[in-house]
Amino acid sequence: MSANATLKPLCPILEQMSRLQSHSNTSIRYIDHAAVLLHGLASLLGLVENGVILFVVGCRMRQTVVTTWVLHLALSDLLASASLPFFTYFLAVGHSWELGTTFCKLHSSIFFLNMFASGFLLSAISLDRCLQVVRPVWAQNHRTVAAAHKVCLVLWALAVLNTVPYFVFRDTISRLDGRIMCYYNVLLLNPGPDRDATCNSRQVALAVSKFLLAFLVPLAIIASSHAAVSLRLQHRGRRRPGRFVRLVAAVVAAFALCWGPYHVFSLLEARAHANPGLRPLVWRGLPFVTSLAFFNSVANPVLYVLTCPDMLRKLRRSLRTVLESVLVDDSELGGAGSSRRRRTSSTARSASPLALCSRPEEPRGPARLLGWLLGSCAASPQTGPLNRALSSTSS
């Protein structure tokens, strides 16, 4: 006989969650199988896509401020994608966390780390573009790849700092039916005399803080940056949005669509401590919106590719390249890869955002396949540094 459910103090919502049972309904089991397949596929796609993006942007492209942002976004998404197989396993074994408390804490922390890092990095990208337009001379003098990396490190540190409470308050809780939850247990540390008040205040604090810091504030920064850029460009008589703008717009839209529902349900969940009537709604919806948030990491690499205009043509061309690269012996490639690496190793100062989709000389073999993923969107910038910084404002 086990009495796991009673070994530690739990919040009322957790106690009642522990009563919920796995379903025996056949149609629901089919949905479970579909969910496992979908998450498995997303895991694979996310790992491959983000791995390729990291390789292409990190090793096959001229390093610019923009590629630095994309590099760190892809790194965040790769981390999230790497944790997705474990979530898939959780689904596959009947919604039970069989991997222990430590891994439960780590797995959940990666999810939240990605959430904060994505929000912070998207804010940085928007502010960066705003500075280029509003303070072009300052941007020209201070916008370096090294500076961008330093900003990213600071943002990662902030993301880690914000993730600490989620690591601390994550726990494994045994359900009455024998399954194990990997979930918040805000009574783990100093529960205090009034359990209900502690549960309510801590859950609300967590939900509101992550909504503000990882969603509302980043979106506010993005929106105000976009407004500032639009106003400035209107004065200059610019109309058509550039390619990098389309990329950022797509990534920001995906971020808002994927994370928005999660934050809504997270806030509802916090209310459900004091309002039990919300619990069934939260229990139904939260798994779906959490998966949607995870899928943001799978969607981003696709967006990097889709926002390049010649994507379909390059896709057709690259399919031939795939076959060539598989069938051609390494010696026949004539060391194209290494010469390409030498050519792109310059750490340019304030390179244009168009550099993410710029067209260097056409690579051969496997490098071309990787090239279509992120490269070859716009003409390579030929102008001087100041002109280049100014021209980037059209993007």
Epitope: A5, Q21, S24, R175, G178
Partner: antibody
Framework: EVQLVQSGAEVKKPGASVKVSCKAS????????IEWVRQAPGQGLEWIGV????????HYNEKFKGRATLTADTSTSTAYLELSSLRSEDTAVYYC???????????????WGQGTLVTVSS | DIQMTQSPSSLSASVGDRVTITCRAS??????FSWLQQKPGKAPKRLIY???TLDSGVPSRFSGSRSGSDYTLTISSLQPEDFATYYC?????????FGQGTKVEIK
């Protein structure tokens, strides 16, 4: 037809233990929870705890933690309540009741056993 | 723990009368609430769950309603077999708690 049939009345001395059984029939025993409730003579109802027969996992009212033990035998579809260190104030009728839950919601005590009178007297 | 305050503790009524019993929860329970009927020497029987849903086999003269944290059991036309003690139960949070009971007696 759902039925919960409990064991007969017991008379115990203070400090002793008592084990009350509750045999379920007419439904899938392992897919429902079994709750235990007691009622002292002329008094109201008091919740003791709940057990999931399929897993053996249980949850107790703090008041009974350490003294009450809930178990279940799936082969005979029987749930048990064992109460130790009996005191005179434990004299009561002990009831078992069935509760259900789904993946997203739960409800409480739709069917009850007939009750078992436990008398604690020296 | 959530306290369930039931009133009245007892009432006398005649057959055909409309009877109302109320229960107040000390904190939000959002309809995780039942009404039980108990006759002398018998086990309790659930009449209503989720605040207002009638159990199968329970006569339609019984009804449950909710207004904020106040829950009401109404017997529209009291029948001889309805003379019993009625308890309310909250099952929103552990430990589940019951009201003190309302004894409905023949006037």
């Amino acid at each position: 037809e759902v039925q919960l049939v409990q064991s007969g009345a017991e008379v115990k001395k203070p400090g002793a233990s008592v084990k009350v059984s509750c045999k379920a029939s007419g439904y899938a025993f392992i897919t429902y929870l079994i709750e235990w409730v007691r009622q002292a003579p002329g008094q109201g109802l008091e919740w003791i705890g709940v057990i999931h027969p399929g897993s053996g996992n249980s949850h107790y009212n703090e008041k009974f933690k350490g003294r009450a033990t809930l178990t279940a035998d799936t082969s005979t579809s029987t749930a048990y309540l064992e109460l130790s260190s009996l005191r005179s104030e434990d004299t009561a009728v002990y009831y078992c009741a069935r509760s259900g839950s789904s993946s997203f919601d739960y409800y409480a005590m739709d069917f009850w056993g007939q009750g078992t009178l436990v008398t604690v007297s020296s | 723990d959530i306290q369930m305050t039931q009133s009245p503790s007892s009432l006398s009524a005649s057959v055909g009368d409309r009877v109302t019993i109320t229960c107040r929860a000390s904190q939000e329970i959002s309809g995780y609430f039942s009404w039980l009927q108990q006759k002398p020497g018998k086990a309790p029987k659930r009449l209503i769950y989720a605040a207002s849903t009638l159990d199968s086999g329970v006569p339609s003269r019984f009804s449950g309603s909710r207004s904020g944290s106040d829950y009401t059991l109404t017997i529209s036309s009291l029948q001889p077999e309805d003379f019993a003690t009625y308890y309310c139960l909250q099952y929103a949070n552990y430990p589940y708690t019951f009201g003190q009971g309302t004894k409905v007696e023949i006037k």
